[in-house]
């Protein structure tokens, strides 16, 4: 494979979190080369001396990939062709989180960039009135979070509001022993009025808004990921 | 200064162990993937295993799998080589060496000045 | 495991002649592989990394080519402290290999 290695190609990366036990993405785009024989794709991890993954001749070459990382990986085959190098990587682990280097050979020469991913739990609230409750009480209920988050409630007719005092949070750890199950209750709830529990930890934020009245309730979540142009 | 210092070498009989230590200094330790290298007397580099900044990757030469352990300790800023069942063969000079960079794809930039290791009954 | 094959074992120059060593890899290693210089009852010293890239403190008579399988280093004007031994080592893959190493005598 012969390249002169002095010449030096534009390389992309964008920081990005991933959701513990789900699949996520380390993007990375490149200037991109006419045949796909001649592109060579090599992720990489700080502090790991073995390939996260590699792609060559048009294929995954694996042979050489850190045990950490087998079976996870993959890249967007068809997509290589047009300067796509981003990884899939399935069922992501708490320890998958670091420095990655998006390395990259093509007949015009190599390039690299690194990326920061970060790990953690982060899911939609849902925010429902609890009517078991003696007085007009909300709870919200997230499934998965982790690092541990904050929870804030926030009204739009008491803007600026401290709730802390009229509300609890509790945190109860899931079954696989590292994400959480986020449940705040907010009591002395009037009616007429737009409630937002918001969670956030390093990686996530979340929100949750409860519209109550007389006549129906309407409900809407997003979610946001932090330091991430994702 | 960036420095390692290895100790723990010596005379053993064959079959008996020994473990080695490198103290790091003037870097931070648990950024670089660290490296045993060996030099039997009068012959060339050997590569013997290495770890990864965490410690949670280790890496071995198939001559010594199974017999040998790498490990680290952060607090100490202290890198290890328990040595088992040692063998003639594993009489050589051990080195600890830092990883150059951060992905394992650069050479070996800080070396220590070696201990020698001597199998013999 | 990747074999690297290292010419010449030894070889005998005088001050100011250009010397070159060549390291081949059993199969492609890109460029990851890097150059030691050795002397006797000391420690290796890395000279370059990534084939060319020169080790920082390193002089510019020493550099380094290639890439995939064949790997060449120059002593451009060879000084009266370059008599060593110089080793390529390969790092694409574990366990990480080492040339046999080649002699440079004086004449």
């Known amino acids: 494979f012969g390249i002169s290695g002095r010449h030096s190609i534009t390389v992309t990366t964008v920081a990005s979190a991933g959701n513990i036990g789900e699949d996520g993405i380390l993007s990375c785009t490149f200037e991109p080369d006419i045949k796909l024989s001649d592109i060579v794709i090599q992720w990489l991890k700080e502090g790991v001396l073995g390939l996260v993954h590699e792609f060559k001749e048009g294929k995954d070459e694996l042979s050489e990939q850190d045990e950490m990382f087998r079976g996870r990986t993959a890249v967007f085959a068809d997509q290589v062709i047009v300067g796509n190098a981003s990884l899939r990587l399935k069922n992501v682990q708490l320890t998958d989180a670091g420095t990655y280097k998006c390395y990259i050979i093509t007949s015009k020469g190599k390039g690299n960039a690194n990326l920061e991913y970060k790990t953690g739990a982060f899911s939609m609230p849902e925010v429902n009135v609890d009517y078991n409750a003696s007085s007009e009480t909300l709870r919200c209920e997230a499934p998965r979070w982790f690092p541990q988050p904050t929870v804030v409630w926030a009204s739009q007719v008491d803007q600026g509001a401290n709730f802390s005092e009229v509300s609890n949070t509790s945190f109860e750890l899931n079954s696989e022993n590292v994400t959480m199950k986020v449940v705040s209750v907010l009591y002395n709830v009037t009616i007429n009025n737009t409630y937002s529990c918001m969670i956030e930890n390093d990686i996530a934020k979340a929100t949750g808004d409860i519209k109550v009245t007389e006549s129906e309730i309407k409900r809407r979540s997003h979610l946001q990921l932090l330091n991430s142009k994702a | 200064e960036v420095q390692l210092l290895e100790s723990g070498g010596g005379l053993v009989q064959p079959g008996g162990s020994l473990r080695l230590s490198c103290a790091a200094s003037?870097?931070?330790?648990?950024?670089?993937?660290m490296h045993w290298v060996r030099q039997a007397p009068g012959k060339g580099l050997e590569w013997v295993s290495a770890?990864?900044?965490?410690?949670?990757?280790?890496y071995y030469a198939d001559s010594v799998k199974g017999r040998f352990t790498i490990s680290r300790d952060i607090s100490k800023n202290t890198l290890y080589l328990q040595m088992n069942s040692l063998r003639a063969e594993d009489t050589a000079v051990y080195y600890c060496?830092?990883?150059?960079?951060?992905?394992?794809?650069?050479?070996?930039?800080?070396w220590g000045q070696g201990t020698t290791v001597t199998v013999s009954s | 495991d990747i074999q690297m094959t290292q010419s010449p074992s030894s070889l005998s120059a005088s001050v100011g002649d250009r010397v070159t060593i060549t390291c081949r890899a059993s199969r492609s290693i890109y460029t990851w592989l890097a150059w030691y210089q050795q002397k006797p009852g000391k420690a290796p010293k890395l000279l370059i990394y990534d084939a060319s890239t020169l080790q920082s403190g390193v002089p510019s008579r020493f550099s380094g080519s290639g890439s995939g399988t064949d790997f060449t280093l120059t002593i451009s004007s060879l000084q009266p402290e370059d008599f060593a031994t110089y080793y390529c080592q390969q790092s694409y893959s574990t366990p990480y290999t080492f040339g046999g190493g080649t002699k440079v005598e004086i004449k």
């Open positions: 003037g870097f931070t330790f648990n950024t670089h993937a």
């Open positions: 770890i990864s900044g965490s410690g949670g990757s280790t």
């Open positions: 060496a830092r990883l150059l960079g951060r992905f394992g794809e650069y050479g070996m930039d800080v």
